[in-house]
Interface confidence: low
């Protein structure tokens, strides 16, 4: 035997090389078949119309074909055959690879509720050989359950993944990443995740800006709701009491101009959207007005929970004077 | 000089079939690849497929697939081209056409040589 | 199937005339066009190959011209020899013909 033929990898739309080659020639026909055993090329004669075929090289110790546009119908054996004293008869087997025709990405629902767990499909549509899907929300790799379906040779993949969203979600993408030798670089597609979730509440005092609060000085609360939906009600109420006759309520602002002591007490900043409603309070204590002596530096921290009770106590340096409970999210 | 001679007239029935010769001579039977062209009375030409003797491998136009049949007998430098199914829309002049390979610039079934034409007439 | 389609069906010129026989393919055939002439009761002629190469034997003033899918054959002074039909015929895949353009005496 000496005729020789190596096996093609070929990506589809891509180029095919096909060489028959001779080791030990006499000028004995090389003609080249398709996997039909119709000819495709008779020494450097093209008895086959397809114009996709063209002679790269021939010689009494080659005939080389290139395969231009090639199609997953064109993969198969083509035979090499040599012409001498008995034939011979040499194979190369073109495999073709096909790259996914078409990713699609699928969430069961567009927005969804914080909590819930959602289900995002992932379809790599005929390619060969199969597709691996792999999945990531940011950039944390997540496992999916994939199934193949087979149909003519091609594979349609779909991978499952089962999501349970948090409100941190919102506005992350899911990104379906396809695996395929076919395909060179990252292949994927994604779609952002709307994760609607209740308010969260926080109350910031605007004014007095050292945070002592006087008799007849100004207080500004503005209270900050942020949720998804936004929320389009925030309301301002005093816990277990009417709200002062001089407190002036301005959208998500409090004002309460020459405070006194009977302005002591809970301030609640409620909002609300259609996932929920959450409340911050602000528990207001009114000092005497200052004396010549400066007043210390104080700070105050809020934060927000809908669980825990975190206590903000402010004092001053004046022995005997009560500390003021400040603010309190839930 | 390269000569294509094709076998004589034939009258035949709807339904059956019907072969026609051509014998190449003046040169190497294994240079040519030979086609079939019709042409019904009146009417253009239609090419109906092609053969490279030495290898026996046929292509075909697709209006004829599966009811033409070509085939070639290198030991007598003979193509044949067998018509199957006849009806009175195949009657016409069939020629044989040869085409010879001009090196690495052949690209395709055009015709320099031509048999004289054999006239099938389907008729009940 | 690529389909060919010649115009005019018919042309009516004189001796001497310069003529222009147009082919359209239904696709990209890029050069592989052929002509020939066809007389009454006689086989084919090869006039022009691979759009524009001249056949042996035949004479100059015969040219074609074109790629792709538009083509020409011109016939650059006609003689009494050359009222016949024309056919333009596409080898790229298999082969087709044209449907014929008969070229008459006017």
């Known amino acids: 035997q000496n005729l020789f033929t190596k096996d093609v990898t070929v990506i589809e739309g891509e180029v095919a090389t096909i060489s028959c080659q001779v080791n030990k020639s006499d000028d004995s026909v090389i003609q080249l078949l398709n996997p039909n055993r119709q000819t495709i090329y008779f020494r450097d004669f093209r008895p086959l119309k397809d114009s996709r075929f063209q002679l790269l090289n021939f010689s009494s110790s080659e005939l080389k074909v290139s395969l231009t546009n090639v199609s997953i119908s064109d993969e198969g054996r083509y035979f090499c055959q040599l012409y001498t004293d008995p034939p011979q008869e040499s194979y190369t087997t073109i495999t073709v690879l096909v790259p996914p025709r078409n990713l699609m990405i699928d969430i069961q629902k567009d927005t969804a509720v914080e909590g819930e767990e959602i289900e995002v499909n992932c379809t790599a549509m005929a390619s060969k050989p199969a597709t691996t899907i792999r999945w990531f929300k940011g950039n944390t790799e997540l496992k999916g359950k994939s199934e193949v379906e087979e149909w003519s040779d091609m594979y349609t993949v779909t991978s499952q993944l089962m999501l349970k969203v948090h409100k941190e979600d919102d506005g992350v993408p899911v990104i379906c990443q396809v695996e395929h030798p076919a395909v060179t670089g990252n292949l994927q597609t994604q779609r952002y995740l709307e994760v609607q979730y209740k308010p969260q509440v926080h109350i910031q005092m605007t004014y007095p800006l050292q945070g002592l609060t006087r008799e007849g000085d100004a207080l500004e609360l503005t209270c900050e709701a942020i949720g998804k939906p936004q929320p389009v009600m925030v309301t301002w109420v005093r816990v277990d009491d009417e709200m002062p006759q001089h407190a002036v309520l301005s959208g998500p602002n409090l004002f309460i101009n020459n405070l006194n002591k009977t302005d002591n007490g809970t301030y609640r900043c409620e909002a609300s959207n259609i996932v929920g409603k959450a409340h911050s309070d602000y528990m207001l204590y009114v000092y005497d007005p200052p004396t010549t002596i400066p007043p210390p530096t104080t700070t105050t921290t809020t934060t927000t929970t809908t669980t825990t009770t975190i206590l903000t106590i402010i004092t001053d340096s004046r022995a005997g004077e009560e500390g003021s409970i400040r603010a309190v999210d839930h | 000089q390269v000569q294509l001679v094709q076998s004589g007239a034939e009258v035949k029935k709807p339904g059956s079939s019907v072969k026609v010769s051509c014998r190449a001579s003046?040169?190497?039977?294994?240079?040519?690849?030979i086609s079939w062209v019709r042409q019904a009375p009146g009417q253009g030409l239609e090419w109906m497929g092609g053969?490279?003797?030495?290898?026996?491998?046929?292509n075909y136009a697709q209006k004829f697939q599966g009811r033409v049949t070509i085939t070639a007998d290198k030991s007598t430098s003979t193509a044949y081209m067998e018509l199957s199914s006849l009806r009175s829309e195949d009657t016409a002049v069939y020629y044989c056409?040869?085409?010879?390979?001009?090196?690495?610039?052949?690209?395709?079934?055009?015709?320099?040589?031509w048999g004289q034409g054999t006239l099938v007439t389907v008729s009940r | 199937d690529i389909q060919m389609t010649q115009s005019p069906s018919t042309l009516a010129a004189s001796v001497g005339d310069r003529v222009t026989i147009t082919c359209r393919a239904s696709q990209s055939i890029s050069s592989w066009l052929a002509w020939y002439q066809q007389k009454p009761g006689k086989a084919p002629k090869l006039l022009i190959y691979k759009a524009s190469s001249l056949e042996s034997g035949v004479p100059s003033r015969f040219s074609g011209s074109g790629s792709g899918t538009e083509f020409t054959l011109t016939i650059s002074s006609l003689q009494p020899d050359d009222f016949a039909t024309y056919y333009c015929?596409?080898?790229?895949?298999?082969?087709?013909f044209g449907q014929g353009t008969k070229l008459e005496i006017k």
């Open positions: 015929q596409q080898y790229n895949s298999y082969s087709t």
């Open positions: 056409a040869g085409d010879i390979s001009r090196g690495s610039s052949w690209y395709g079934y055009y015709f320099d040589y």
């Open positions: 053969i490279i003797p030495i290898f026996g491998t046929a």
């Open positions: 003046g040169g190497t039977f294994s240079s040519y690849a």
